[in-house]
Interface confidence: medium
Amino acid sequence: MDSLGTAATQFLFDLFKELNKTNDGNVFFSPVGISTAIGMIILGTRGATASELQKVLYTEQGTESSRIKSEEEEIEKREEIHHQLQMLLTEISKFSNDYDLIISNRLFGEKTYLFLQKYIDYVEKYYHASLEPVDFVNAADESRKKINSWVESQTNVKVKDLFPEGSLNSSTKLVLINTVYFKGLWDREFKKEHTKEEDFWLNKNLSKPVQMMALCSSFNFTFLEDLQAKIVGIPYKNNDISMFVLLPNDIDGLEKIMDKMSPEKLVEWTSPGHLEQRRVDLRLPRLQVEETYDLEPVLEAVGIHSAFSEHADYSGMSARSGLHAQNFLHRSFLVVTEEGVEATAGTGVGLKVSSAASCELVHCNHPFLFFIRHRESDSILFFGKFSSP
């Protein structure tokens, strides 16, 4: 059987492709955040709903996946997913003096609705999430504000109003929240006096001004001949976390990269054996990206249907029938400056009853892909496409 990592990387790609289809501009999201939120949902689902969700986070090798599985195998697979996510969260959450990386999970439940103690015990065990009762029935907007203020507190006030006015109502029974907050300093700082205004080319004809940072230093680097692109790894202090930038040679070369990209290739390109230490003249724009997605249609496009239907089986979460995912909000925020990065993501799932990145020149003055990877856990914290300042 393959690990969570392979399926999660495939899932990342599927998500990215779907988000890219519907978003002309930038794309930015947290695969770890979304996977964690889905893990918390899997804990509470049973039957076909659970199987469907499990498939996006876990794959089998060979033909085994095509045969009908026994209930015991399904349970074993489910436990393996949660165990791996638990290990991932533990690894990621290890304290560091060099950066802040905080993943937070919380459940906000309608105070009169009854959630299974087993679900609450397990969600705390695997995801360090607690349940906070709120009054959706009589004070939905007050509850919404309470949830939003918790998200703000977990993301250093970078993610505000995750749930907009009117998005939660008296029929909301559970809001499942995952936030990922990262603030790091570059291992080799860009000097502010080297930052200059330059053109960033959206395509061959259109450009926008950006503040372009510059640094000539030793980085993990390689040419990707088949893709006509370069990849550079920019480490943060203590090298635990790096931002990788995948830059096409041509201004309009990003589409070709995305067509040829695969989860296996991504793993291969970023592996220590593939990259080599080179002197690189890196020109990287100061970035500020903020994206909000309703992931429901995106997840439906990658094969998750029943979790959002009124026939969803959430019987592992509650004894009450009719519980289903109402929406799946994901907001992510990224700032890249000379000192380093600040990145956050908030994922919220609202449940209602049928009734939440001489010298080699790497000049990032045209659309590129980037991702922030945690080395020890080999997980992608954030993934994005920067195509419009």
């Epitope: 009854l114 959630f115 087993k118 019987s315 592992g316 009450r320």
Partner: antibody, heavy 132, light 107 residues
Framework: QMQLVQSGGGVVRPGGSLRLSCAAS????????MSWVRQAPGKGLEWVSG????????GYADSVKGRFTISRDNAKNSLYLQMNSLRAEDTALYYC?????????????????????????WGQGTLVTVSS | ETTLTQSPGTLSLSPGERATLSCRAS???????LAWYQQKPGQPPRLLIY???SRATGIPDRFSGSGSGTDFTLTISRLEPEDFAVYYC????????FGQGTKVELK
């Protein structure tokens, strides 16, 4: 279909012992906390004892504390009530009931079984008569 | 421990009539964690209402619950022949207590 089938009732002398069983089917037994509730002849309902989903936490009414022991075997989808030092006032129809589970942070943190719980499915009941 | 007092003790009504059953708590029922059960002779209780006003799965909409704090009401809008039974309220917020019951009998 969901079922709770009870057994083990009968007539016993004061000071005697009895073990009640409740076999569950039609639902994932180890997802749920379970309770025993009794009803004396012609009287109302009284919560007796409760156990959480994995058996790690139990609770008892003051009237049975030290005499009764609740347990479960998730592998067998079964709930038990071991009743020792029985008294005449223990005479009642005993029901096993599935708990809808917790609602409040307080009860969750305190792990007080039986508090913050209602009962959504009940067994058919088994009569326990304590008489000399 | 909370004491629940149900009234009246007995309610004599005809099919089609409206039944109003009261449950008063000696102290505030935290979070409106009050449930109503129906029990027919020789049968176990059946959950009707939880959270003071939410109908349990499969319960007809003629049954409704209301109230908060210390005063709660179960209303059966139009009595059906199968509704004649004993009704119990339960405080499941801060204690494990049940009321003594209200019998709804055929007039």
């Amino acid at each position: 279909q969901m079922q709770l089938v009870q057994s083990g009732g009968g007539v016993v002398r004061p000071g005697g012992s009895l073990r009640l069983s409740c076999a569950a089917s039609g639902f994932t037994f180890d997802d749920y906390g379970m309770s025993w509730v009794r009803q004396a002849p012609g009287k109302g309902l009284e919560w007796v004892s409760g156990i959480n989903w994995n058996g790690g936490s139990t609770g008892y009414a003051d009237s049975v504390k030290g005499r009764f022991t609740i347990s479960r075997d998730n592998a067998k989808n079964s709930l038990y009530l071991q009743m020792n030092s029985l008294r005449a006032e223990d005479t009642a129809l005993y029901y096993c009931a599935r708990e809808s589970s917790m609602t409040t942070v307080t009860t969750y943190l305190l792990r007080e079984v039986g508090v913050g719980l209602d009962f959504d499915y009940w067994g058919q009941g088994t009569l326990v008569t304590v008489s000399s | 421990e909370t004491t629940l007092t149900q009234s009246p003790g007995t309610l004599s009504l005809s099919p089609g009539e409206r039944a109003t059953l009261s449950c008063r708590a000696s102290q505030t029922v935290s979070g409106s964690y009050l449930a109503w059960y129906q029990q027919k002779p020789g049968q176990p209780p059946r959950l009707l209402i939880y959270g003071a006003s939410s109908r349990a799965t499969g319960i007809p909409d003629r049954f409704s619950g209301s109230g908060s704090g210390t005063d709660f009401t179960l209303t059966i809008s139009r009595l059906e022949p199968e509704d004649f039974a004993v009704y119990y309220c339960q405080d499941y917020g801060s204690s494990r207590t049940f009321g003594q019951g209200t019998k709804v009998e055929l007039k």
